[in-house]
């Protein structure tokens, strides 16, 4: 898995809804991989990590000040759905299959 | 300033090109506002930080298991272009009004 | 080497048409905006017009003591630049310099060619 | 339009002596944290030349004697020590706002 001296990258997270209280209201999957973004935004920034502008600069700003400015954050930059059955409001289980932004596609420093 | 138990918040970053090394291209100006984004992205996620349904997801079960899962990131959510002077091949100096993603103007947890 | 050569001028009558033409090289012309500065006899320097750039439907701007009379065009497949000179007045004697450069700054000039109305 | 004004309009200086010229706007050419200011030097019979660019970068190819300074309405050009290749005019010019203007031009002879 990817520690703190580890680049950015996407790592499972499996999330169970019963954990986080979501299971009031879905039914189903009871749990589901989220992924989650981890690691260090690391000079020099990869291609891979798709760095924005802001992103570069605030790394070359950290190298050359590390105490007063922090390094580029690991964090999704873009996100898939799942679907899942829940309950509407009357109570009648109803599949949504685009539930959109639940789970990490990419991962990226920002 | 935000410090680590601030919320998620933008705050000022004074960048001067020379101190990354950037003064051999860009002619002026000589600094910008770059902000940064500072702070933490603590239970519950309010508003203004824009949260996505992962980093809810991500906030409550780094809730339940702080020790397995970080808490979402304090990230710039949307960039603004500046305009900068920079000489072209020719070594023409060029003014291009939109040299865009170099400053925050929005930050979220993600 | 960077090179821009102005048509021969000359003189024209009160009223009168000329058309000056700028052969460049030793650039990217396509890539700069092109320009007429002008210098009246003995007198200080006065921009004409420029022409932008494909990118920018190729507009023009002149100033305000030739818009209805001069314009200016451009052939990118030739490198050149024009200057139609339409309804010409005495003040408008002097030399005439085809620059080339940026949205910022003129960078390159041309030896300049002399316009002179006079009946 | 933006108005330039330099001074003096002319100006004569010993060889190897300092040489001061200035420029003034009638409104701001700062702008994007960027001064619209470029100077030319033009000597006799032959087009202007760029010589300080953005207040105060040298052109290409500019002798190390030539500077730039100011921001806002108020521009210097200076000449640490006149050389005698130096006798010209100088011009100032703004490019902020179409048109772009130049300033009248100041005369710059030996003494």
């Known amino acids: 898995s990817a520690g703190a001296g580890s680049h950015c990258q996407k790592t499972s997270l499996r999330v169970n809804f019963e954990d986080i209280g979501w299971d009031s209201w879905i039914i189903a999957p009871k749990e589901y991989e989220a992924y989650e973004c981890k690691g260090g935004c690391f000079f020099p920034l990869a291609d891979d990590v798709t760095p924005t502008k802001h992103a570069i600069v605030q790394t070359l700003v950290h190298l050359k000040f590390p105490t007063k400015v922090g390094k580029a954050c690991c964090v999704p930059t873009k996100l898939s759905p799942i679907s899942v059955l829940y309950k509407d409001d009357m109570g009648v289980p109803t599949l949504k299959y685009h539930y959109e932004g639940m789970s990490v596609a990419e991962c990226g420093c920002r | 300033s935000a410090g680590a138990g601030s919320h998620c918040q933008k705050t000022s970053l004074r960048v001067n090109f020379e101190d990354i090394g950037w003064d051999s291209w860009i002619i002026a100006p000589k600094e910008y506002e770059a902000y940064e984004c500072k702070g933490g992205c603590f239970f519950p996620l309010a508003d203004d930080v824009t949260p996505t349904k992962h980093a809810i997801v991500q906030t409550l079960v780094h809730l339940k298991f702080p020790t397995k899962v970080g808490k979402a990131c304090c990230v710039p959510t949307k960039l603004s272009p500046i305009s900068v002077l920079y000489k072209d091949d020719m070594g023409v100096p060029t003014l291009k009004y939109h040299y865009e993603g170099m400053s925050v103007a929005e930050c979220g947890c993600r | 080497e960077v090179q821009l050569v102005e048509s021969r001028g000359g003189l024209v009558q009160p009223g009168g048409s000329m058309r000056l033409s700028c052969a460049a090289s030793g650039f990217t012309f396509s890539n700069y905006w092109m320009n007429w500065v002008r210098q009246a006899p003995g007198k200080g320097l006065e921009w004409v017009a420029h022409?932008?750039?494909?990118?920018?439907?190729?507009?023009?701007h002149y100033a305000e003591s030739v818009r209805g009379r001069f314009t200016i065009s451009r052939d990118d497949s030739k490198n050149s630049v024009y200057l139609q000179m339409n309804s010409l007045k005495t003040e408008d004697t002097g030399v005439y310099y085809c620059t080339g450069g940026s949205n910022y700054v003129f960078a390159f000039w041309g030896q300049g060619t002399l316009v002179t109305v006079s009946s | 339009d933006i108005v330039m004004t330099q001074s003096p309009d002319s100006l004569a200086v010993s060889l190897g002596e300092r040489a001061t010229i200035n420029c003034r706007a009638s409104e701001s050419v700062d702008n994007y944290g960027i001064s619209f200011m470029n100077w030319f030097q033009q000597k006799p019979g032959q087009p202007p030349k760029l010589l300080i660019y953005a207040a105060s970068n040298q052109g290409s190819g500019v002798p190390d004697r030539f500077s730039g300074s100011g921001s806002g309405t108020d521009f210097t050009l200076t000449i640490s020590s006149l050389q005698a290749e130096d006798v010209a005019v100088y011009f100032c010019q703004q490019s902020k706002e179409v048109p772009w203007t130049f300033g009248q031009g100041t005369k710059l002879e030996i003494k």
């Open positions: 022409i932008r750039l494909k990118s920018d439907n190729y507009a023009t």
